[in-house]
């Protein structure tokens, strides 16, 4: 019968040829009376057999990632009679893996959005690298993820590639971060290959800033001839938030005379001071009112940032008009 062990050949051998093993008949007494032959895909081009000894050689550099298995057939013939000594036999040559492929991030570019002020541990995104090497061959395709850039705000789970927040971030200080993740095979051991990817993490706004008046005192004037409904001037607050989180409502906090009103221009986010009742210079030539400003939308969990509304004082001077 045929005698052989399982055949393995390492991929990417840089030698001209590589001895894989021996195929022989147990009837072969070593006197060169038998001839061994190799048949099948790869015979003669990738593998050869020493026809006298049955020794098999790879005569070409192999790439396991291209082809990991060769199925060949062997024959052994008695040179004197030309007859087969053994029935033709099929055998397998397996290409064994070396760590010749670096991890690759296939879903690049990565981009994620996370609310500012998110607590530690908040999941941002998962990055995944793949390695063409054999996952069943040692640690050639076992990956470990690490953070090359992004501390102290982000962390990555070494085995999953899950990126989490590790420190609260304020969009009003910095609104986006570039995080660089490295994937290393061989679970980081010597001889490891690595690949990197960049993740753009954008912070979305939350309403963590209340509007604040630009001025603590505004001076306006109104003619005593002005009809009710007249706009006598504008006041303005600023809000570091953006979008609907910066939408605000102005209102009167103090006006004993009940002469003025404030309406909000939602286009410009300005407060417009309106004359509610006609004024008379001879009766009262100046007024003092207090205005306040609040955000339009404040979720319950963010009320802590909005406890005291910003206020401003408005001094209004009445202008005299000659009366007949």
């Amino acid at each position: 019968g045929w005698v052989w062990n399982q055949f393995f050949v390492p991929e990417e051998m840089n030698t001209t040829s590589h001895h894989i093993g021996q195929l022989r008949s147990d009837l072969d007494n070593g006197n060169n009376s038998f001839q061994y032959k190799l048949l099948g895909a790869g015979a003669g081009s990738t593998f050869i057999i020493d026809e006298r000894t049955g020794d098999i050689y790879a005569i070409q550099k192999l790439d396991r990632e291209e082809r990991s298995l060769y199925i060949l057939r062997a024959q052994v013939i008695d040179i004197a009679t030309g007859r087969a000594v053994e029935p033709e036999s099929e055998f397998v040559i397996k290409v064994s893996d070396i760590n010749d492929n670096e991890p690759k991030f296939l879903d690049e570019p990565y981009e994620a959005i996370v609310p500012e002020m998110s607590p530690e541990g908040t999941l941002v995104i998962q990055v995944t690298a793949s390695d063409a090497d054999d996952p069943s061959s040692g640690n050639n395709a076992r990956l470990l993820y690490s953070l090359l850039q992004g501390q102290p705000y982000f962390s990555v789970e070494p085995t999953t590639g899950v990126i989490r927040i590790s420190s609260k971030m304020d969009r009003e200080l910095q609104d986006e971060y570039w995080v660089i993740i490295q994937a290393k095979d061989m679970i980081g051991q010597p001889g490891a290959l690595s690949g990197t990817t960049s993740v753009l993490i954008k912070l979305s706004d939350v309403n963590d800033n209340k509007p604040i008046f630009k001025e603590s005192l505004y001076r306006l004037t109104v003619s005593e001839s002005a009809p009710t409904g007249t706009s006598i001037g504008t006041i303005m607050a600023y809000d570091n938030d953006i979008g609907e989180n910066a939408e605000m409502d102005y209102s009167i906090e103090e006006d004993d005379s009940q002469t003025f009103d404030i309406i909000t221009n939602h286009e410009t986010q300005e407060g417009i001071v309106i004359l509610k009742k006609k004024v008379d210079f001879e009766h009262q030539n100046h007024y003092g009112i207090r205005a306040k400003v609040k955000n339009h939308h404040v979720p319950e969990q963010l009320m802590k940032y909005h406890t005291e509304a910003s206020t401003t004082f408005i001094k209004i001077q009445v202008e005299d008009v000659d009366e007949p």
């Epitope: 840089n14 030698t15 001209t16 040829s17 081009s45 990738t46 050869i48 006298r52 050689y57 005569i59």
Partner: antibody, heavy 121, light 107 residues
């Protein structure tokens, strides 16, 4: 008896081309690797190129890569070397040599007498 | 590439003497080394392959030894037809490379 007979050498100007042939007999040509080795006048041996049996794999010395092409015709049991963009330093006797068996597959166990290539203006 | 260095360049010996030729590889080539003999105007002839296996028809006075980076060709007793140039060659890595040769001449 294994025999190798080279032909096709001659005098050629720099930049010119030549095609060398090596007719083989006495063995199963397609089962063996074949080589070209050259020897400049008064110098040592220099490997040029190798082709595996059946022609699947070819290898070249850096000095000839991109200029020379090795090929074989199993039906004629003939090895070829197409030489283009020839230079003065390619002047040599060109030998073909048969590969061996097993672990000596990419070796050189039988040599031809050689054919002379002279590159000169 | 693997650099093969032969020494000495010339070896002057008398008939019947023992010749020892050395060949060193710049890195390990296992046992994938061959020795060739070349006489003026002739093609090289294979003497030894696999560092120590004599080719068909080669007399027993020729022997090879060594592995890795250091190799030796020994001619136990020089005959008149042995005076020639001897080359070592590695076939473990591409490109295949030859040593510069050792000329064995009559003293």
């Amino acid at each position: 008896e294994v025999q190798l007979l080279e032909s096709g050498g001659g005098l050629v100007q720099p930049g010119g081309s030549l095609r060398l042939s090596c007719a083989a007999s006495g063995f199963t040509f397609s089962s063996y690797a074949m080589n070209w080795v050259r020897q400049a006048p008064g110098k040592g041996l220099e490997w040029v190129s190798t082709i595996s049996g059946g022609g699947a794999n070819t290898y070249y010395a850096d000095s000839v890569k991109g200029r020379f092409t090795i090929s074989s015709d199993n039906s004629k049991s003939t090895l070829y070397l197409q030489m283009n963009s020839l230079r003065a330093e390619d002047t040599a006797v060109y030998h073909c040599a048969k590969g061996g068996m097993g672990g000596y597959y990419y070796g050189m166990d039988v040599w031809g007498q050689g054919t002379t290539v002279t590159v000169s203006s | 590439e693997i650099v093969m260095t032969q020494s000495p360049v010339t070896l002057s010996l008398s008939l019947g003497e023992r010749a020892t030729l050395s060949c060193r590889a710049s890195q390990s080539i296992s046992s994938n080394l061959a020795w060739f003999q070349q006489k003026p105007g002739q093609a090289p002839r294979l003497l030894i392959y696999g560092a120590f296996t004599r080719a068909t028809g080669i007399p027993a006075r020729f022997s090879g030894s060594g592995s890795g980076t250091e190799f030796t060709l020994t001619i136990s007793s020089l005959e008149p037809e042995d005076f020639a140039v001897y080359y070592c060659q590695q076939y473990n890595y591409w490109p295949l490379t030859f040593g510069g040769g050792t000329k064995v001449e009559i003293k």
